[in-house]
Interface confidence: low
Amino acid sequence: GSERTCCPVNWVEHERSCYWFSRSGKAWADADNYCRLEDAHLVVVTSWEEQKFVQHHIGPVNTWMGLHDQNGPWKWVDGTDYETGFKNWRPEQPDDWYGHGLGGGEDCAHFTDDGRWNDDVCQRPYRWVCETELDKASQEPPLL
């Protein structure tokens, strides 16, 4: 495919990535699928600077990111290494809390009202952020 050199309409460019900020809520899996259908992924936060950028745009609202531990260890959806990467958990989090009464623990990460991360039940209908990198090959065929 061709390389994407500018962001799609209604996406925000920042540091060679494009971001789309939802204004409605979906379960984590549905949000993940939405981003994939846009040839993107749920946002992967790799630095303080990116954390602040996203936080500025989402405000004090619970918002899904591309981090989960549904298969055991914490993983970023784009393969970024979790152990050596940036982390912004609230103190005492993640705690895989079982006391919510919804069955199971908490396997999906979201931004909380102050920007810090929390793990929560993946079925909760939170807003979400999609991200795609500029200069990566687009899935769309090139124009002839």
């Epitope: 303080w48 602040k52 990467g85 982390k87 958990w89």
Partner: nanobody
Amino acid sequence: EVQLLESGGGLVQPGGSLRLSCAASGFTFSRYGMMWVRQAPGKGLEWVSDIAPDGRGTYYADSVKGRFTISRDNSKSTLYLQMNSLRAEDTAVYYCAKMMPTSTVSFDYWGQGTLVTVSS
């Protein structure tokens, strides 16, 4: 060698104010998040507040939100904690700490602490 030297603690009456300082050396201060933690008598370490490397991202524990303000002066390699409306439960040894580069929760160096006593 990383060094963090806290100062500014002391005895203050309930409702009073103090400003803690932390002078840092031995590392590039402007590249790291910094935090304040405290340890009350007979208790464990409690996170109080922290601040992004450029000073624009600040976070507070619920117990101090609206009363404490964290700030930093990168030109002086100094971290501050302005503490207002102090309460007896704020009595503790306050430590400044250098955050690890890949985390805003973990720290790898901390100072010797400064004692804050809130009592009438």
